[in-house]
């Protein structure tokens, strides 16, 4: 790589940063950036609040949250004061007719009669054939099965009560959840009238009952958590300590660890090459060729032809060669990456508070999601409930004259219709009135608000951390020159001056994400379409948008670092960050990959460590522990293990995201430092001695030989 060529490349991406004698790290005297975007964002938030208030005023989430019987009366209120739970006669019809959108808009509504009951059924029961001719009183009332609709005569025939759907044909042991009776016991599936021949439904029901496996399971799970929550917390504490320890120890072991990891990857690739060669050789000797196979969509068939393994071998060999070449020719860059990782470890050690900033982000994200969810729920229930006539089997004798789907009054049920099972059921909410007519637009506004606020919160986190870590890098005398409260001051600074810039970056990302969501929705709708061209175009679009989102995230991240340091607006910061990175593209790629590798290993270490410890502890394989450390007796020991592993992953991700931000910030600062300074007395480098040593540079010593501490 010639120097002249390099200069030309650099100039294509702007001039290197000039020395600025006044620059002392994150600039103190700032002004507000992207004011227009800030105003726009604040107006949007104001609008979002207004939407929330309107939703709150017009909405009635009771309609979704509180159970209502078939007549539209709430359970647990008024005439049903002593009947707080809702029983679905055939809960499986809910499963067959429910999807996420209908639940979001209309609550859990099912095309089956619903009755308020004082307690949920405790035992499995099905109407026996010999009970069809008995009276409702004999079968239901005297057996304490008070689950029929109100007012069904005692001496009515059971079969006619079932035909009119006045009484349930089966009961499943249920537990109240969200005020509704949901099956929870592993019962043998009752022979359900009307659906015995429908295999898919029957299978679905069996599957559902299996998956709702048993009151015992629910109780056992609860017991297990009750017995092991303390130890789960201990496991999470271990995950926290391991994450911290890993990050803090990086300054000591980063070099050897990176080397071991790279060699490990080389080893894995080498084994892959060997394995592919062996498979290829065996198949070649057999003469198994792709020409014999012909075209097939069965991918597993390709495993049995030599060309597949040859192709895999070539790919792995190329990857191995590239990695070896990188190791040989870019070892200097790898050393810089290692030194930066060590530096990042030091920075985190100096500013431990940054490690817990993800909690702030988490809380803010939770607030955004909760606000959106509540607003969406209230909006969805802002219309007047509409009821229509409905019958489970419109082909029944007497139903032909009934106008199904015509509006009706739920308080005036068609009690004695000629059509069996005719009911006045909840259909949805009316779209009369300005709010109701604008409902779709308001929901879209809400979704936009959700994405924008979420992205803004994430941007805030990145910018705050960047500000804190930049103040570490640009402290000439470490730790003396580091501000007292770097995180808090970075937080205040970011909120005060850069809300607009963060909103701008978040908006760009939001628009791309919304486009992706729309594309996913279209793709979902076109699932049935078998047109390969359409599928291909859709795939290309999705791929392009995915790449665009990745790129914008990368650009935004670095723009926020520049904003945190220089306090310039989003566009200038993004341009500066981009050109700076492009001038050092090889370093960027190497650092990025080394960091990814290291953090992946870190996560693996933390999650694996906690997982192994949890496994040995909860499965009682660790012998000789004191009485205080005895593992609890559990029904399902995998439950706390899985909980611990998932918790450990979340914790590790939180910590390592901070560390990743730290590395990126220090890297950008390092590149700036290289371009801005030259090591002379008036332009000393701010980087650590180890980095200077790797680069073969040094700072001139002052005449009085007062060496600055590093």
């Amino acid at each position: 790589m010639g120097g002249k060529q390099r200069d030309k490349d650099d100039e294509a991406y702007g001039k290197p940063v000039k020395y600025d004698p006044s620059f002392r790290g994150p600039i103190k005297n700032r002004s507000c950036t992207d004011v227009i975007c800030c105003v726009l964002f604040l107006l949007f938030i104001l609008g979002y609040i207004v939407v929330g208030i309107v939703a709150w005023l017009y909405g009635d989430p009771r309609q979704v949250l509180y159970p209502r019987n078939s007549t539209g009366a709430y359970c647990g209120m008024g005439e049903n004061k002593d009947k707080p739970y809702l029983l679905y006669f055939n809960i499986f019809s809910c499963i067959l007719s429910t999807n996420i959108i209908s639940v979001a808009e209309n609550g859990l509504q099912c095309p089956t009669p619903q009755v308020c009951v004082s307690s949920c059924p405790e035992d499995p029961w099905t109407v026996g054939k010999n009970q069809f001719s008995q009276t409702v009183g004999e079968v239901f009332y005297t057996k304490n099965r008070n689950f029929c609709l109100p007012g069904v005569p005692w001496n009515m025939m059971v079969i006619t009560s079932l035909q009119q759907e006045l009484c349930p044909s089966f009961l499943l042991p249920s537990a109240p959840a969200l005020g509704r009776c949901f099956p929870w016991t592993n019962v043998t599936l009752p022979e359900l009238p009307g659906i015995t021949n429908d295999t898919t439904i029957a299978q679905g029901i069996s599957g559902l009952i299996d998956s709702l496996n048993a009151r015992d399971i629910s109780v056992k799970i609860f017991e297990d958590f009750a017995h092991s929550w303390y130890w789960i917390l201990v496991a999470l504490g271990v995950a926290l300590l391991l994450s911290l320890l890993f990050i803090l120890l990086l300054r000591l072991v980063a070099g050897p660890l990176v080397l071991v990891l790279i060699l490990g990857v080389l080893g894995v690739l080498a084994y892959g090459i060997y394995y592919c060669w062996e498979e290829y050789r065996v198949l070649r000797d057999k003469g198994a060729s792709i020409s014999q196979l012909g075209f097939t969509t069965n991918l597993s068939a390709y495993q049995s032809v030599q060309e597949t393994w040859l192709a895999a071998l070539i790919v792995l060999a190329v990857l191995e060669a590239i990695l070896l070449l990188v190791l040989i020719f870019l070892r200097q860059r790898i050393r810089i990456a290692i030194a930066l990782l060590k530096e990042a470890s030091k920075a985190v050690g100096q500013m431990m508070s940054t490690m817990f900033y993800p909690l702030v982000t988490f809380v803010l994200l939770l607030i955004c999601i909760a606000y959106w969810a509540m607003t969406a729920l209230y909006l969805a229930t802002s219309g007047q409930p509409q009821y229509v006539l409905w019958a489970s089997n419109i082909s029944s004798p007497g139903c032909e004259k009934v106008s199904i789907n015509t509006s009706c009054n739920p308080m005036d049920q068609p009690v004695n219709s000629s059509c069996p099972g005719l009911m006045c059921v909840f259909q949805g909410y009316s779209s009369k009135g300005l709010v109701q007519r604008s409902l779709f637009n308001l929901q879209i506004y809400g979704v936009l608000g959700l994405f924008w606020t979420l992205n803004w919160v994430l941007a805030l986190g990145q910018c705050v951390l960047a500000g804190a870590f930049a103040s570490f890098y640009w402290a000439f005398h470490k730790p003396q020159d580091i501000p007292t409260f770097p995180l808090i001051s970075a937080f205040i600074r970011t909120l005060r001056y850069h809300t607009g810039s963060l909103a701008f970056g978040a908006l760009i990302l939001t628009l791309v994400q919304i486009a992706r969501v729309i594309l996913e929705y279209i793709d979902h709708k076109l699932r049935g379409v078998q047109n390969p061209v359409a599928r291909c175009i859709m795939c290309c679009f999705k791929c392009c948008l995915w790449c665009l989102e990745k790129f914008i995230k990368f650009l935004n991240r670095n723009a926020y670092i520049m904003i945190a340091i220089y306090g310039k607006n989003f566009c200038v910061s993004a341009k500066n960050a981009f050109t700076l990175l492009m001038r050092n593209i090889v370093r960027v790629v190497v650092l990025d990959k080394v960091t990814d590798l290291l953090l992946f290993f870190g996560k693996l270490l933390v999650v694996g460590g906690v997982g192994v410890l949890s496994f040995f502890f909860f499965s009682g394989r660790i012998q000789g522990l004191g009485r205080d450390f005895k593992s609890p007796h559990l029904n399902y020991y995998w439950l706390p293990i899985m909980t611990s592993i998932m918790g450990a992953y979340v914790i590790a991700s939180g910590f390592f995201s901070v560390f990743g931000m730290c590395v990126d910030t220090l890297f950008l600062c390092f590149l700036e430092d290289l371009e801005r300074n030259d090591g002379s007395l008036d332009r000393p480098y701010y980087m650590s001695k180890s980095l200077l040593k790797i680069l073969g540079k040094k700072n001139e010593a002052p005449p009085d030989n007062k060496k600055r501490k590093k």
């Epitope: 054939k129 010999n130 069809f132 001719s133 008995q134 009276t135 005569p153 001496n155 009515m156 025939m157 079969i159 006619t160 079932l162 035909q163 009119q164 009238p193 009307g194 015995t196 029944s396 004798p397 007497g398 004259k401 009690v415 004695n416 219709s417 000629s418 059509c419 069996p420």
Partner: antibody, heavy 125, light 107 residues
Framework: QVQLVESGGGVVQPGRSLRLSCAAS????????MHWVRQAPGKGLEWVAV????????YYADSVKGRFTISRDNSKNTLYLQMNSLRAEDTAVYYC??????????????????WGQGTTVTVSS | DIQMTQSPSSLSASVGDRVTITCRAS??????LAWFQQKPGKAPKSLIY???SLHSGVPSKFSGGGSGTDFTLTISSLQPEDFATYYC?????????FGPGTKVDIK
């Protein structure tokens, strides 16, 4: 074809007993519920009793409850009505009728479809 | 018990007339109502079940309607063989009960 033939009617003194039979043919007797319906001279029809296909459930009109017993012998394809403590007001033509509900139609109940020709019971001293 | 009432108790009509008989239940019986035809000295014959469905072999001139408490039997074009007594019966609530009957005779 489906046929129901009643027998056992006659003249009987008040307080005495009588047993009516109904022989069924042309269908699977054991799968159907059966009714007894009576008609007093010059009057309308009055439902008396029902027995379901397996004999498990029996229901009676209030006027005969405790005095009449409906039963069936599926092996003989025969329906019975045992009438005890007969009264003058029990004088009527007694019909047996098949219920259209068989144990196989889960959700449809249609009531009676096929009737016998009837047997006359006269309660007189 | 459910009381069934029929009106009129008797009616005179000519061949070709359209005749409607009404049956009323003392409480709601949904559509569990049957209509029977009985000629003098003969056993009753089932015409209609579920308020409006014809038993097999019953001519389409007979039609039934209604639900709940009020029901009707209509003979669209009266023929000589249709002069008889017509009974309604509810069959959902024990004890099953018949209406008093409507006698249709020749004018």
């Amino acid at each position: 074809q489906v046929q129901l033939v009643e027998s056992g009617g006659g003249v009987v003194q008040p307080g005495r007993s009588l047993r009516l039979s109904c022989a069924a043919s042309g269908f699977t007797f054991s799968s159907y519920g059966m009714h007894w319906v009576r008609q007093a001279p010059g009057k309308g029809l009055e439902w008396v009793a029902v027995i379901w296909y397996d004999g498990s459930n029996k229901y009676y009109a209030d006027s005969v409850k405790g005095r009449f017993t409906i039963s069936r012998d599926n092996s003989k394809n025969t329906l019975y009505l045992q009438m005890n403590s007969l009264r003058a007001e029990d004088t009527a033509v007694y019909y047996c009728a098949r219920d259209r509900y068989s144990g196989y139609d889960y959700y449809y109940y249609y009531g009676m479809d096929v009737w016998g020709q009837g047997t006359t019971v006269t309660v007189s001293s | 018990d459910i009381q069934m009432t029929q009106s009129p108790s008797s009616l005179s009509a000519s061949v070709g007339d359209r005749v409607t008989i009404t049956c009323r239940a003392s409480q709601g019986i949904y559509n569990y109502l049957a209509w029977f035809q009985q000629k003098p000295g003969k056993a009753p014959k089932s015409l209609i079940y579920a308020a409006s469905s014809l038993h097999s072999g019953v001519p389409s001139k007979f039609s039934g309607g209604g639900s709940g408490t009020d029901f009707t039997l209509t003979i669209s074009s009266l023929q000589p063989e249709d002069f008889a007594t017509y009974y309604c019966q509810q069959y959902t609530i024990y004890p099953f009960t018949f209406g008093p009957g409507t006698k249709v005779d020749i004018k």
